[in-house]
Interface confidence: medium
């Protein structure tokens, strides 16, 4: 017979014939023949395969190394890899999250635009006119200058991006 040149979905070509792939969570033990079907076996305790496959070995689950600041966010199954994330105050250095670094702090004159997560660093922004930040922080946003007028006070010292305005009493007009 004319052998197939392409196989259907969830099949693979071998010896000019199509065999069924192994389902996610199982590895290939032996290819099918005319008399025997594809033989697959479940992945072991700390292993996985996440696609229909013909792999003879399962992949090892990722190890979330605490020495690198990592912890398990989601335990792996036979069909999914372990997902690591970083300990509190740290974030991943890459999409694969192979190691962590301490969240960046925003220097005085800069405020937090976006607080860091386990996978993204702190995003800082310069404090615009009318706002300031006088601390180095991974959480603090730029604060608005104090409004002296609403307190019936006057500006005695102008604010900067690092300092608040200083308010003082209004000069009394003499009679």
């Amino acid at each position: 017979p004319e052998p197939p040149t392409a196989c259907r979905e969830k099949q693979y070509l071998i010896n000019s014939q199509c065999c069924s792939l192994c389902q996610p969570g199982q590895k290939l033990v032996s290819d099918c023949t005319e008399f025997t079907e594809t033989e697959c076996l479940p992945c072991g305790e700390s292993e996985f395969l996440d696609t229909w496959n013909r792999e003879t070995h399962c992949h090892q689950h990722k190890y979330c190394d605490p020495n690198l600041g990592l912890r398990v966010q989601q335990k792996g199954t036979s069909e999914t890899d372990t997902i690591c994330t970083c300990e509190e105050g740290w974030h991943c250095t890459s999409e694969a999250c192979e190691s962590c670094v301490l969240h960046r702090s925003c220097s005085p004159g800069f405020g937090v635009k976006q607080i860091a997560t386990g996978v993204s660093d702190t995003i800082c922004e310069p404090c615009p006119v009318g706002f300031f930040s006088n601390v180095s922080s991974a959480f603090e946003k730029c604060h608005p200058w104090t409004s002296c007028e609403t307190k019936d006070l006057v500006v005695q010292q102008a604010g900067t991006n690092k300092t608040d305005v200083v308010c003082g009493p209004q000069d009394r007009l003499r009679a």
Epitope: N15, S20, T33, L41
Partner: antibody
Framework: QVQLVESGGGVVQPGRSLRLSCAAS????????MHWVRQAPGKGLEWVAV????????YYADSVKGRFTIYRDNSKNTLYLQMNSLRAEDTAVYYC??????????????????WGQGTTVTVSS | DIVMTQSPLSLPVTPGEPASISCRSS???????????LDWYLQKPGQSPQLLIY???NRASGVPDRFSGSGSGTDFTLKISRVEAEDVGIYYC?????????FGQGTKVEIK
Amino acid sequence: QVQLVESGGGVVQPGRSLRLSCAASGFTFSSYAMHWVRQAPGKGLEWVAVISYDGSNKYYADSVKGRFTIYRDNSKNTLYLQMNSLRAEDTAVYYCARRGHYGNNYYSYYGLDVWGQGTTVTVSS
Amino acid sequence: DIVMTQSPLSLPVTPGEPASISCRSSQSLLPGNGYNYLDWYLQKPGQSPQLLIYLGSNRASGVPDRFSGSGSGTDFTLKISRVEAEDVGIYYCMQALQTPRTFGQGTKVEIK
């Protein structure tokens, strides 16, 4: 139409031989693996043997291994079962059956989709 | 060898009523490729067996849709949604995972 016709059955004494034939028509015989299945009087179905589409691979039930030989002649569209050293317990209706497959992928499996009408073998002294 | 066990061995039915036959295998017929290697065959009185269901749940060509196969691993069921008089005969399950192929003992379906 697709058809399998067995022949060669009969009454035979224990220890003697018999050859069964299965003539195929209506399909490309050389593309299909073929099975022999038997049924003793009043009993269920028992698988006997299978041969690959090209005759290169053969498997047998333990009960017939070493006594029966399955073979085929694709030029004659015919399957055979050579039965030697016959025993009383080989008495049965013998059916040939086609192993169905998808398109031209003869590794795929679609059941034993065509059966012959059967031929009766009686082993008795 | 894989042992196939059917139940019941005899099933009296009423035309128009549903019927169900169970088949159990001594080992899983799901080798990890997503298919269950279990067939159902019907042998009508005085006839050769005929294929009803292959790979657990696929109806063979020309088989009425009142027949359905289900199950996975080691436990399988053949259901007839509404039995007709022509459905009488002996039903066999067969494992197609490995040689030797093995059949269940058969379930005799007869009209009450």
